[in-house]
Interface confidence: medium
Amino acid sequence: SGTTNTVAAYNLTWKSTNFKTILEWEPKPVNQVYTVQISTKSGDWKSKCFYTTDTECDLTDEIVKDVKQTYLARVFSYPAGNVESTGSAGEPLYENSPEFTPYLETNLGQPTIQSFEQVGTKVNVTVEDERTLVRRNNTFLSLRDVFGKDLIYTLYYWKSSSSGKKTAKTNTNEFLIDVDKGENYCFSVQAVIPSRTVNRKSTDSPVECMGQEKGEFRE
């Protein structure tokens, strides 16, 4: 139990896409402020978003240090203007988040088709290797760098003149598919981590069609 004018945070929820990770909670504060702490299972608590009136806290900088760690966060509630005040047990009121393992749980962001090139009856479709906020040696890693062979892409393609879709899969960021000469095709891709139990697939990329400027045609 906390002080009479302070309520504990609730509905603590991790929102994470391509490792950009934000903790959200309720309620909107009335006469109170929040501070967030984050920790790994075996680590010390680190405070973030001090005495904020927001109901979200960007924890990306912490989780990208090691995306395979399991993290726990907690949100402390303090009376506005009196952040030294504590609950009856001598501690501020707080609520724990669910555990979060970024590698297993971060949503896959919507991919983008970088280019496609037709040579005769073959088309090479390239997916943009999206940059994440995970760093190694002062450089930002791509989604492929982080997930390696755990990540595949699925290509959906169809003739502009029909709705029958075909699919192809790749362990890299490139597809080489057979097409009918003289036909225009449209493409969409999806990022997939087949061995995940949650958040296995991204949303589909925007559709790109032959005859538009992303493509290139060679006899």
Epitope: Q69, L104, S195
Partner: antibody
Framework: EVQLVQSGAEVKKPGASVKVSCKAS????????MNWVRQAPGQGLEWMGE????????TYNQKFKARVTMTVDQSTSTVYMELSSLRSEDTAVYYC???????????WGQGTTVTVSS | SIQMTQSPSSLSASVGDRVTITCKAS??????IAWYQQKPGKSPKLLIY???NRYTGVPSRFSGSGYGTDFTFTISSLQPEDIATYYC?????????FGGGTKVEIK
């Protein structure tokens, strides 16, 4: 329930080949890499290679690269490991193991004992 | 390839004892360590992945910790059914490699 069921024990002569099968059930077969790990009598575990059941692409431990071939039959959800030019030191239990997200081997077959003896 | 050095190679402890096994990687493997239990005549069984995460259904007396090159596996209170050989494995960089194993026996 995830199950990996391997073929029975084999006795081979030096120089021969052996082909061990691993039939998977209870999960989406093409969604997980299948690995092969062997264990000589009284010894530790040694990784031989892995195959992607979706594409048939494989990666082998350099130590076995010249002698091992991994294949897949999607229609029966079965992976195969063939080891050629057998020698006595290939006597071991051979396991197939499903690689989970991020790398660990979460499910293992019951093992196939291969004995190489003249 | 990355070498994994596991110690001790064998140990004997009493029921209820705290048992600790260490594994050292020849280069950093970040968080990429798994621990397995293998009972005689049986297949290995995954206990810990990502260095510290318990696999589904694994009792809480089993735990793991460490980062980089030095890792520890602990059984907080040894039970008779824990008699087995335990292996560490790095899944950070192919070829995946295992430690030599630690045989745990009851005094």
């Amino acid at each position: 329930e995830v199950q990996l069921v391997q073929s029975g024990a084999e006795v081979k002569k030096p120089g021969a080949s052996v082909k061990v099968s691993c039939k998977a059930s209870g999960y989406s077969f093409t969604g997980y890499y299948m690995n092969w790990v062997r264990q000589a009598p009284g010894q530790g575990l040694e990784w031989m290679g892995e195959i992607n059941p979706s594409t048939g692409g494989s990666t082998y431990n350099q130590k076995f690269k010249a002698r091992v071939t991994m294949t897949v039959d999607q229609s029966t959800s079965t992976v195969y490991m063939e080891l050629s030019s057998l020698r006595s030191e290939d006597t071991a239990v051979y396991y197939c193991a499903r690689r989970e997200l991020g790398g660990p081997f979460g499910y293992w077959g019951q093992g196939t004992t291969v004995t190489v003896s003249s | 390839s990355i070498q994994m050095t596991q110690s001790p190679s064998s140990l004997s402890a009493s029921v209820g004892d705290r048992v600790t096994i260490t594994c050292k990687a020849s280069q950093s493997v970040s968080q990429g360590i798994a621990w397995y239990q293998q009972k005689p005549g049986k297949s290995p069984k995954l206990l810990i992945y990502f260095a510290s995460n318990r696999y589904t259904g694994v009792p809480s007396r089993f735990s793991g910790s460490g980062y980089g090159t030095d890792f520890t596996f602990t059984i907080s209170s040894l039970q008779p059914e824990d008699i087995a050989t335990y292996y560490c494995q790095q899944d950070y960089s192919s070829p995946w490699t295992f430690g030599g194993g630690t045989k745990v026996e009851i005094k």
